[in-house]
Amino acid sequence: GVEQILKRKTGVIVGEDVHNLFTYAKEHKFAIPAINVTSSSTAVAALEAARDSKSPIILQTSNGGAAYFAGKGISNEGQNASIKGAIAAAHYIRSIAPAYGIPVVLHSDHCAKKLLPWFDGMLEADEAYFKEHGEPLFSSHMLDLSEETDEENISTCVKYFKRMAAMDQWLEMEIGITGGEEDGVNNENADKEDLYTKPEQVYNVYKALHPISPNFSIAAAFGNCHGLYAGDIALRPEILAEHQKYTREQVGCKEEKPLFLVFHGGSGSTVQEFHTGIDNGVVKVNLDTDCQYAYLTGIRDYVLNKKDYIMSPVGNPEGPEKPNKKFFDPRVWVREGEKTMGAKITKSLETFRTTNTL
């Protein structure tokens, strides 16, 4: 299993371990879900589900999620809250993850061009942490410059990747357009043709990044959409096989799947669509919208079911003097959201064939 190929078996993994994990996943045809965490509660829900499913997990903070982690009351001028929140989330996850006994990849999600100051802030924290501990704070980061020209997208990735490679850090990048909206990137009115990345585009990324380091993955568009955006674009995960074939032929390598690929915008996708992506080299699947809704359902149902016990601190159907503390204590009702979010992640771990891979 996964543990045999990792130097660090539990907690946040970095460097060669991240590469080995993704290589193992690609070879064994499973993918690791990446869960957007916005709080200690959502982080715990993901860690617990992964532990109970004997699976590795990726925890990621989006730009907005990181700002929320820091607190909505903090100004995000100059990306201040997003930087501080991402760093706070990273330290929190680093301190708690070993208690769950599973390998965890610590990642930052979509960073568009206008959010690069956030990326700079995280990278500075990585470099400071690297000086002290010999490894970066984060396992990996994502740059999403898919709104820019391919030339600018790739050259910006190259610039940052050189800094990251010095710390043996993983980079995820996006080329082609994922429909819908995600932090800083809105592609709801994109040309249909741009919603399918071409093999030549993917190879251009490989050609530019691979000489720097093999530690990168590509989020290529195959008709996928962020959130539950109901565009009229057909999902075609089998296109990913074309990317692998084209790059393999251009490089002249024997490896059947030279690319590490990422599945974005998976909400509403079928099991077979996920499996097709995974069979063609997808090693990471982003889960956000579905987890957000799952988290709500537990809290929603609790509030509806306990309505008569939470209308006042004292007094419920069992008597006017009966205390309601055990019903309104946040540890009780927030926990219900953790359970339902955890259940959704458990199901996804099965779908992505991640269960029992440790």
């Epitope: 249909k192 043709e193 990913l240 074309e242």
Partner: nanobody, 119 residues
Framework: QVQLVESGGGVVQPGESLKLSCAAS????????MGWFRQAPGKEREFVAR????????FYADSVKGRFTISRDNAKNTVYLQMNSLKPEDTAVYYC????????????WGQGTQVTVSS
């Protein structure tokens, strides 16, 4: 726009095989995703299988997985559907379709070929 003409349909017994062909004319065939769909009497048209432009990637409906194989020959501008272990529920009109990547979904359709599986 690609023009598509299906052939190869017929009447077979359960358990037998049949191979459908779809001849395409038009320059965009070699860069299009090609697919097969079917429509049984009184039912909606349903997806069967599709194949990417070089043939590297394929995708099947659960109902035909392991029994049907889609393939293509770009030199002959033709896409095929090999159907094995046919069942009565496979009876339908089978349509060939093409999707140029600028379309976002299948945009060109053939006229269809009838497949009947009956003992």
């Amino acid at each position: 726009q690609v023009q598509l003409v299906e052939s190869g349909g017929g009447v077979v017994q359960p358990g037998e095989s049949l191979k459908l062909s779809c001849a395409a004319s038009g320059r965009t065939f070699s860069s299009a995703i090609m697919g097969w769909f079917r429509q049984a009497p009184g039912k909606e048209r349903e997806f069967v299988a599709r194949i990417t432009w070089s043939g590297a990637g394929v995708f099947y409906a659960d109902s035909v997985k392991g029994r049907f194989t889609i393939s293509r020959d770009n030199a002959k501008n033709t896409v095929y559907l090999q159907m094995n272990s046919l069942k009565p529920e496979d009876t339908a009109v089978y349509y060939c379709a093409a999707q140029a990547l600028s379309q976002g979904d299948f945009g060109s359709w053939g006229q269809g070929t009838q497949v009947t599986v009956s003992s």
